[in-house]
């Protein structure tokens, strides 16, 4: 099984934009990264810009589905 | 042992066309996050294009955006940089590089020239 | 885009001396920061990441220091090797940014 942990101090830079690192703690797999985006950035390292018009779109969403 | 090898620098006119390849072996390609960094001769480090194999995603330079293309194609671990209306500025030593949490490995550079 | 700026831009030291070298970003980068060493017709090497962490196979005379906009390279005893153009780097936004580059020469 596998779970995530935040990243140390020194593997931060993975995610850039201000994006939050997470380590992918698997026992049978070499360690993996993750990143949960800031407002505004998406891609695996959060190095994407994502246009206004898009966020204004999930914003939507998201409001619809609550 | 991690390698990275760029090709297809060469001397091009003002307004040609090259594509150069970075060639990268003994680590997990789609993992990292591949970027080209040149140096015009005498002076410093700047920054040119980044691609995250793994999605796509691609971020350019001012300097270069609407002209350069970066890509990769994960199945033979290369990435590429296409270079269009090249102009004399341009004239530099082109370096790929991976970074996991910084710019870790380098290639050894190859020379693109920019001249009439 | 955040500009680093580096200092001195050259200097002149012997060996054993003690150099530190200076970056200042144009904004908080958090501890993103990284230095590479570079000798001529050669590519740049690693040498610090995340501030202050030594990158593997680095000798533990290097040594880096800062977070928010501050940051410094230390070599605590200069070496005949190690006369080269340090550079320091940000990759806490993209673009990713180079500071201007710091020359050590031989005194």
């Known amino acids: 099984t596998s779970h995530l942990v935040k990243c140390a101090e020194k593997e931060k830079t993975f995610c850039v934009n201000g994006g939050e690192c997470f380590m992918v703690k698997d026992l049978s797999n070499p360690s993996r990264y993750l990143c949960k985006c800031q407002p505004g950035f998406t891609g695996a390292r959060c190095t994407e810009n994502v246009p206004m018009k898009v966020q204004n779109q999930e914003k939507a969403e998201e409001l619809y589905q609550k | 042992e991690v390698q990275l090898v760029e090709s297809g620098g060469g001397l091009v006119q003002p307004g040609g066309s090259l594509r150069l390849s970075c060639a990268a072996s003994g680590f997990t390609f789609s993992g990292t996050w591949i970027h080209w960094v040149r140096q015009a001769p005498g002076k410093g480090l700047e920054w040119v294009a980044a691609?995250?194999?793994?999605?796509?995603?691609?971020n350019y330079a001012d300097s270069v955006k609407g002209r350069f293309t970066i890509s990769a194609d994960t199945s033979k671990n290369t990435a590429y940089l296409q270079m269009n209306s090249l102009r004399a500025e341009d004239t530099a030593v082109y370096y790929c590089?991976?970074?996991?949490?910084?710019?870790?490995?380098w290639g050894q550079g190859t020379l693109v020239t920019v001249s009439s | 885009d955040i500009q680093m700026t580096q200092s001195p831009s050259s200097l002149s030291a012997s060996v054993g001396d003690r150099v530190t070298i200076t970056c200042r970003a144009s904004?908080?980068?958090?501890?993103?920061v990284a230095w590479y060493q570079q000798k001529p017709g050669k590519a740049p090497k690693l040498l610090i990441y995340?501030?202050?962490f030594l990158y593997s196979g680095v000798p533990s005379r290097f040594s880096g220091s800062g977070s928010g906009t501050d940051f410094t390279l230390t070599i605590s005893s200069l070496q005949p090797e190690d006369f080269a153009t340090y550079y320091c780097q940000q990759s806490y936004t993209t673009p990713p940014t180079f500071g201007q580059g710091t020359k050590v020469e031989i005194k």
């Open positions: 691609i995250t194999p793994a999605d796509g995603s691609t």
């Open positions: 904004q908080d980068v958090s501890t993103a």
């Open positions: 590089a991976t970074y996991m949490f910084a710019m870790d490995y």
């Open positions: 995340s501030a202050s």
